[in-house]
Interface confidence: medium
């Protein structure tokens, strides 16, 4: 059955209640110069509007502090109001390593990110840090790598490993959850000139992730004891017509091309899904596509296999799909899938359908295919036009969390965390934020607060209290380090 009655119950005490943000652009300088500059200034407000130094007067200075970054203050204020236990944000690779290699490290950017993490920890909020978060508009690569063919060039994978190593070294004492790459399975939207470009770029992204994971496993895990994965875009697929076999096959094919494409090599076999390989090969034989999945060497298969510590899924909606034979040598046409917009469904302004039961089906599918592993939903949310009373978002959160709870309580899926997307919206973008672009809070925050403090949807008389030992204590030593390690 699709919709089942709501359940009453709670998530475990160590469940991660999170909120996700995309790339945090580092502030280049702390914006409180009065603490580092000993001079006094007078502002000529009516004349030339410049600051004029007052000679002969010297002020006491103090060392720079993390809260001197205006941005960080804003982040912390929003996070404190969210009452989350975890904050997922992404570093800006191009800011940290502008040259793409370790020859020019932007220490100020790293200091900024360290501040975000350490100040969060003081509020009891642990970080899940994403190393690379490409967006459709911008690949987010350092310029030299972009000009050297980006992800079509295998050496970008090695550059990523070096960057990851730097981040593990600089932040790994405080960060215990890492995402290497956000939604590599969506870079097909950018590398879409041909299927071979798409599959070639995906191959190098897989290698980049595996190299970073193995570096962490070998050099950093023994002392830092963290966990590393990558986040896959993981919308569920349903047949548009449940009575048509071809639609059922199309739905499974969508999951193979969208999720298994990356999950199979990393979680299971070290190679691409047989179903995907065979489907592309059959189209190739019939002259409908010249695409081909890369043939992996034995060494590449061994490199990829098993390089995840948990499963991280970004889930937003369910797509209704049907089979339609498409000619052309691109990823989109290789799948032979057509999407159907069901206008009877509750949908957002950007046409995201609200289909809560899809997330439960997804979680069961992942467990059935890849085994009983820890799963985090690392981004989940909806756009809502309302600037204050965002009722669609409240409805979405409540219903989707209900289905996640069913997966936990009834299906026994090892769900470890839910990260709502996203903290603050950006100007002129779909409104996914809990806060507006000028930091005004929306009413969905109170709703999420309530779910977090109740640990779900408890029975009337059940306690939501957790003992200190049961709570998420993944970074007990972090607070000590925050005080002791210089920023």
């Amino acid at each position: 059955k699709e919709s089942t009655p709501d359940v009453q119950g709670q998530f475990p005490c160590d469940f991660s209640w999170g909120v996700t943000e995309s790339v945090l652009k580092p502030e280049s300088v702390a914006s409180s110069p009065q603490f580092s500059d000993p001079h006094l200034y007078v502002w000529n407000a009516t004349g030339n509007r410049l600051l004029h130094r007052v000679e002969g007067v010297r002020l006491k200075t103090r060392p720079a502090q993390c809260t001197d970054f205006v941005n960080i203050k804003k982040q912390l204020e929003m996070l404190a109001r969210m009452k989350v236990t975890h904050y997922r944000f992404a570093l800006d690779w191009a800011s940290v390593l502008p040259t793409g290699n370790l020859s020019a490290v932007n220490r100020q950017a790293l200091r900024y990110y360290r501040c975000v993490v350490s100040e969060g920890l003081k509020l009891g909020i642990s970080a899940m840090v994403t190393l690379y978060y490409p967006t459709h508009a911008h690949l987010g690569l350092p310029e030299p790598l972009l000009h050297a063919d980006g992800w079509l060039n295998p050496s970008t994978a090695e550059a990523f490993q070096a960057y990851a190593g730097l981040c593990f070294q600089e932040l790994g004492d405080l960060v215990k959850l890492w995402i290497t790459i956000n939604e590599p399975n969506r870079l097909s939207d950018i590398y879409n000139r041909s299927g071979n470009d798409t599959y070639g770029a995906a191959h190098n992204l897989l290698v980049a992730h595996a190299l970073a994971w193995r570096l962490y496993d070998r050099q950093f895990r023994p002392s830092q004891r963290g966990a590393v994965s990558l986040s896959l875009h993981a919308d569920w697929a349903e047949p548009a017509n449940p009575y048509a076999d071809s639609h059922w096959r199309a739905a499974e094919r969508f999951l193979q091309f969208e999720i298994a494409w990356f999950a199979e090599p990393l979680f299971k076999t070290g190679d691409y899904p047989a179903a995907m390989r065979e489907y592309i090969a059959s189209k190739h034989r019939r002259g409908l596509s010249s695409s081909a999945l890369p043939r992996l060497t034995e060494a590449e298969r061994r490199l990829l296999k098993g390089t995840v510590d948990f499963c991280a899924l970004n889930h937003f909606t369910t797509r209704f799909v049907m089979h339609e034979q498409l000619a052309g040598s691109r990823y989109d046409s290789d799948r032979d899938i057509q999407f159907l917009q069901d206008i009877t469904r509750l949908s957002s302004p950007t046409r995201l359908a609200v289909i809560p039961w899809g997330v439960r089906k997804l979680l069961r599918w992942v467990r059935r295919n890849y085994g009983d592993m820890d799963i985090y939903i690392t981004a989940s949310g909806i756009d809502d036009q309302a600037l204050e009373d965002d009722r669609l978002r409240k409805y979405y959160l409540g219903k989707y969390l209900q289905e996640v709870l069913k997966a936990y309580l009834i299906d026994k899926v090892r769900i470890k965390g839910y990260y709502a997307f996203k903290l603050a919206e950006e100007k002129s973008k779909p409104r996914f934020g809990f806060f507006t672009s000028d930091f005004k809070a929306k009413s969905s925050i109170q709703f999420y607060n309530k779910v977090i403090s109740s640990r779900g949807f408890p029975f009337e008389n059940s306690s939501s209290r957790c003992s200190q030992t049961q709570e998420n204590t993944e970074c007990t030593v972090c607070l000590f380090l925050v005080q002791k390690k210089p920023l």
């Epitope: 295998p154 191959h203 193995r214 023994p222 034995e298 061994r302 490199l303 098993g306």
Partner: antibody, heavy 120, light 111 residues
Framework: QVQPQESGPELVKPGALVKISCKAS????????INWVKKRPGQGLEWIGW????????KYNEKFEGKATLTADKSSSTAYMQLSSLTSENSAVYFC?????????????WGQGTLVTVSA | DIVLTQSPDSLTVSLGQRATISCRAS??????????MHWYQQKPGQPPKLLIY???NLESGVPARFSGSGSGTDFTLNIHPVEEEDAATYYC?????????FGGGTKLEIK
């Protein structure tokens, strides 16, 4: 210290079988292949096969199919190689070696070797 | 199976000079930007020690006087300047496909 520890020398009779062990430490045992390599006096090195302790999957050099059986015990972080129907050809030093972290399949960490002597 | 042929079988090099060892594969061991060829040093009574991985990458802790080069089917290990402790047998190994194979070995003596 990541270097694997292999079991001691074995003197066995022709036709018998022997099981040698390789205990791993200093890293997560389930995440890296353990390879086995044969070295006979005056001859080169021969790769026998690997086992991936994470799921117990194995791959063998065809030459050693039916001769060598690779297993792993996750609870004790120990890999084993059993050699059956032994002949004098099987007298050799057997090394276990952990693969590197690049997936290049080069062997970074080697055990000290176990000498197996097959003699009546 | 890919056959690796090392040459020479043995060589004697004066202290401080250059030693060059070749390894030829019966088919290419390079693909998608990588050359799956590695070099090891083995001394009597000891396990082999990895020197070079992926044709040209120096394993950590190995002196910089060791270097590797090549792609496709032809690979070279260079040692310069040779030191007394370099007396050993050197093996190449490929991991392009199964089964992995080793070269026959080159015995280096120092005079």
């Amino acid at each position: 210290q990541v270097q694997p520890q292999e079991s001691g020398p074995e003197l066995v009779k022709p036709g018998a079988l022997v099981k040698i062990s390789c205990k791993a430490s200093g890293y997560t045992f389930t995440r890296y292949d353990i390879n086995w390599v044969k070295k006979r006096p005056g001859q080169g090195l021969e790769w026998i096969g690997w086992i991936y302790p994470g799921d117990g999957s194995t791959k063998y050099n065809e030459k050693f199919e039916g001769k060598a059986t690779l297993t792993a015990d996750k609870s004790s972080s120990t890999a084993y190689m059993q050699l059956s129907s032994l002949t004098s050809e099987n007298s050799a030093v057997y090394f276990c070696a952990r693969s590197d972290y690049y997936g290049s399949r080069s062997f970074v960490y080697w055990g000290q070797g176990t000498l197996v002597t097959v003699s009546a | 199976d890919i056959v690796l042929t090392q040459s020479p079988d043995s060589l004697t090099v004066s202290l401080g000079q250059r030693a060059t060892i070749s390894c030829r594969a019966s088919k290419s061991v390079s693909t998608s930007g990588y050359s799956y060829m590695h070099w090891y040093q083995q001394k009597p009574g000891q396990p082999p020690k990895l020197l070079i991985y992926l044709a040209s990458n120096l394993e950590s802790g190995v002196p910089a006087r060791f270097s590797g080069s090549g792609s496709g089917t032809d690979f070279t290990l260079n040692i310069h300047p040779v030191e007394e402790e370099d007396a050993a047998t050197y093996y190449c190994q490929h991991s392009r496909e199964l089964p992995y194979t080793f070269g026959g070995g080159t015995k280096l003596e120092i005079k």
